[in-house]
């Protein structure tokens, strides 16, 4: 049955009414309003914006809108003692210094409180030494350096280009390699698309532009001082030495003008292959140290940032459900930005604002959703997903019993080519069905569905005629809901053409140039892509909150479980002798997946046939669907990552942004040929297969007939 069967519904109060109420012009207006000044987490400006959003959501008609505050560890540069990097000669004189700030964009010259580029949570320090260029500082880059090139980073300052993986993983890898400092820079190969001008004349990164960002390795912990528990008024805080995920070496980001000055002098080994070369006119020598004439010169970092416990504010709005008020569908995105937040996050926050306004309009006309909808404007996402994680920690008992779904709403755009969706397999069919009903905004697809343009531009690698939907990784506010609590989650945004644009993210990401004008002039002048994203996110929330039977298809989980089991088995089979020697078998996992497939199929048949007018049976079936994602949670968590508890998905240990399937087995197998104690290593593989097989079987049994 369709959504229009929800309570107090008149024919016009259906999904169409909700979608028709969404207006591109409003999103544009909200984006402008949210981007005129910086809204850095922990600042007065961001508190004022929280209060503004609270007030407007109340006006829009939500039942209640509250601020939820927490006192968490944040990081700021020292205003009187700026961070910079220098080249020093043999006498210790600074012969070159990197810039202290980005040149402000036109029209913003007089804006105060623009935080200069910095790596949040870097410790203080002034290390000096020889430079080693480490490419993207990925695990495989350090393998290449250490194992193949025999280059030792111990006691060196490393310089790494941004891109490919989360910056925190780069720093962790550098620390493990023994580096004493890290310089991060944006290479034009990754942040300057050919044929496009630099901002303000285009959407490319100018040479003075710099990407800010945190460099934590929290692994889902939230506030570094209160892992597992909310940072409330009576919190017990760890000492800074015991804080979770803080880097131990100084780190600082620079733009490509400054990077040129450091890299042009590099000597030592040549780059191992072309994949280590960017687009600057430098040799990309690996080092260590500078070439002949400059060999006595060193690099020195000057980092004076401080970590401070600071108050942050989430805005939580409630639209009470008429039939199942104790079932929560959550739409959340962050509000804090590094500077103006033209894309990240305000292109998402503006969409959430318009979705709230549309729901509020329907509510004012007498409609209510079947289930409760919670709207969230999260704080301190940029400092490690802190606002969302602290709120989820505070409300974990309610969420694990009542959470139906979480839809994330950070940046609505990272390009204007096609849709990008990452979600739980439970939502595949919801996304497919919804996008078939929405109009494509794309040129050349007038009168065609969004599903059609999306499928054409981003086809599934496995199933012809279907679009690509990716695994959830992390690096955004869905993390605690999905990876820790096991609440079905999804995210959608408009993206670039990954095949033709090889740069990482979008060029102006986390720079001062991420302005309203960037969006309005270059990405989405008509705000049609924003509107489409609003329709996708809002439509998903509408269906999840309003459909009589939850729009989850457990059979899609069965399909991916088989795919993931095949994949991890094939990785293990790269070690056929060890599989025999240590009696490693995947039979239990494949058996569990087979059982899951059969039980899911039977459940789906029952779902078609049961009496939906019986509220007890309806609730029972919906609860089985709601709790299926929860069933994949292992209360003990993954090895050394207790807050990543989902057995099927976790953020990659090598790139927080990417999702990994069967992460416990994957990590146990990773680089296993380099484990000195193979008996122990293969024992851990066997244990992880056991955990995965048990979890899949246990999840399957939650779908069995209850008696």
């Amino acid at each position: 049955k369709s959504s229009n069967e929800a309570t107090n519904i008149t024919p016009k109060h259906n999904m169409k009414a909700f979608l028709d109420e969404l207006k591109a012009e409003n999103i544009k207006k909200f984006l402008y309003n949210f981007t005129q000044i910086p809204h850095l987490a922990g600042t007065e400006q961001n508190f004022q914006l929280a209060k503004q959003i609270q007030s407007q959501w109340k006006e829009f008609g939500l039942d209640s809108v509250e601020l939820a505050h927490y006192d968490v560890l944040l990081s700021y540069p020292n205003k009187t003692h700026p961070n910079y990097i220098s080249i020093i000669n043999e006498d210790g004189n600074e012969i070159f210094n990197t810039s202290l700030f980005e040149p402000p964009p036109p029209g913003y010259e007089n804006v105060s409180d623009i935080v200069p580029p910095f790596s949040a949570f870097s410790p203080q320090g002034m290390p000096e030494g020889d430079l080693v260029y480490v490419n993207y500082a990925r695990t495989e880059d350090f393998f290449k350096l250490e194992r193949d090139m025999k280059i030792n980073c111990s006691g060196k300052i490393v310089i790494a280009r941004y891109g490919k993986v989360f910056r925190g993983n780069k720093v962790k890898n550098a620390q493990l390699a023994g580096a004493k400092g890290v310089i991060l820079y944006s290479d034009p190969a990754d942040y300057f698309a050919p044929g496009v001008k630099s901002y303000p004349d285009g959407w490319n990164l100018p040479g003075g532009g710099v990407q800010r960002g945190n460099i934590l390795n929290l692994n889902g912990a939230g506030d570094p001082l209160t892992p597992g528990y909310p940072a409330n008024e009576y919190a017990y805080r760890r000492g800074i030495a015991e804080a979770v995920g803080l880097p131990s070496i100084p780190v600082h980001p620079i733009g490509y003008y400054d990077a040129q000055k450091l890299l042009e002098k590099m000597g030592g080994s040549a780059p191992p292959d072309s994949s280590w070369r960017g687009s600057l006119k430098v040799p990309y020598n690996v080092g260590p140290g500078f070439t002949g004439n400059f060999s006595t010169q060193k690099v020195k970092m000057h980092i004076h940032s401080t970590n401070e416990v600071t108050r942050i504010y989430n805005v939580i709005g409630t639209l009470r459900g008429a039939v199942e008020p104790d079932r929560y569908v959550i739409l959340g995105g962050h509000r804090d930005s590094w500077v103006f937040g033209g894309i990240d996050p305000q292109s998402g926050a503006a969409v959430v604002h318009e979705i709230v306004r549309s729901f509020g309009t329907l509510k004012k006309e007498g409609w209510r959703p079947r289930r409760t909808i919670l709207f969230a404007s999260w704080d301190a996402e940029e400092f490690g997903l802190l606002g969302s994680t602290e709120w989820a920690e505070e409300n974990s008992r309610l969420l694990q019993e009542r959470g139906v779904a979480y839809i994330n709403a950070d940046s609505s755009i990272e390009g204007n080519y096609t849709l990008r969706v990452d979600c739980t397999p439970l939502m595949y069919s919801l996304v497919h069905n919804l996008t078939k009903e929405l109009k494509s905004p794309d040129e050349g697809f007038e009168g065609k569905s969004l599903y059609e343009s999306w499928t054409k531009k981003s086809p599934s690698p496995e199933f012809s005629g279907m679009p690509r939907i990716s695994k959830l990784g992390s690096g955004n506010d869905f993390e605690v809901f999905f990876q820790r609590l096991g609440i079905a989650s999804g995210r959608a945004r408009y993206t670039k053409n990954w095949e033709t644009n090889k740069f990482s993210g979008y060029p102006l990401y986390h720079s001062v140039y991420e302005t309203y004008e960037l969006v309005e002039k270059f990405y989405d002048p008509m705000f049609k892509y924003h509107l489409t994203v609003a329709q996708v996110r809002g439509g998903m929330v509408f269906e999840l909150a309003n459909s009589i039977v939850l729009p989850f298809d457990c059979r899609d989980y069965a399909v991916v479980l088989r795919k993931y089991a095949d994949k991890i088995y094939s990785i293990s089979m790269k070690h056929p002798q060890e599989m025999k020697t240590y009696s490693v078998s995947f039979d239990s996992l494949f058996s569990a997946v087979k059982n899951f497939t059969e039980i899911a199929s039977k459940f789906s048949e029952r779902l078609q046939d049961f009496d939906k007018s019986n509220p007890i049976v309806l609730r029972m079936m919906n609860d089985q669907l709601m709790f299926l994602e929860r069933a994949f949670i292992d209360p003990l968590g993954l090895p050394d990552r207790p807050f990543y508890r989902h057995v099927i998905y976790a953020p990659s240990s090598h790139n927080k942004y990417a999702g990994e399937s069967f992460p416990g087995i994957y990590d146990a197998l990773f680089d296993i040929e380099s484990k000195v104690d193979p008996s122990k290593a293969w024992g851990e593989v066997k244990r992880q297969i056991y955990v995965a097989a048990f979890t899949v079987q246990a999840a399957a049994e939650t779908l069995s007939e209850v008696a």
């Epitope: 070690h575 380099s674 000195v676 193979p678």
Partner: antibody
Framework: EVQLVESGGGLVQSGGSLRLSCEAS????????MTWIRQGPGKGLEWVAN????????YYVDSVKGRFTISRDNARNSLYLQMTSLKAEDTAVYYC??????????WGQGTLVTVSS | DIQMTQSPSSLSASVGDSVTITCRAS??????LNWYQQKPGKAPKLLIY???SLLSGVPSRFSGSGSGTDFTLTISGLHPEDFATYFC??????????FGQGTRLDIK
Amino acid sequence: EVQLVESGGGLVQSGGSLRLSCEASGFTFSNYWMTWIRQGPGKGLEWVANIKPDGTENYYVDSVKGRFTISRDNARNSLYLQMTSLKAEDTAVYYCGRMIQFVINIWGQGTLVTVSS
Amino acid sequence: DIQMTQSPSSLSASVGDSVTITCRASQSINNYLNWYQQKPGKAPKLLIYTASSLLSGVPSRFSGSGSGTDFTLTISGLHPEDFATYFCQQSFSTPPITFGQGTRLDIK
């Protein structure tokens, strides 16, 4: 069971040649660095040579460079040490080993090479 | 090349005693230090890697410690089968792989 079995040792005249073999079982040979280590009578352990999993790189102790050649045949799970221009000081028990991060975690039983002058 | 120096070169002890063998590197090797045990006529066996990690199956009476240049192998409560020669080896800067000269542990 994971094991390495050396063969090919024996008595040889100074200036002569010998080829040692090492057969691996119980592990996926082509994934691992391999090494030869020797131990002179009543002496300590001395690294001789090692070779990359794909055979494209090898390294030698200075005293054997130009005389010894380490090689491997991954299809046969076998490691070799071709020794030429042998000297009395090359007399030793030669062990083949599996190396992980330059730690030798599996050793063969050894094969004795005696060079008579 | 990094030189490894073991001390003592030999020592005598009784069953039940605790003994400590030290190994010094000529330069810092972080924790890239491994210990092997060799019995007469047999191949060496790995006991401890990266200074303090005990290989599976090695009794817990063996322990390693140290970092930088100074390392120790301790056997707490000698068993009869522990009388053997012990070698340290650095795996920090390679090639070459270098070993200590060995410490022979005899029954008193």
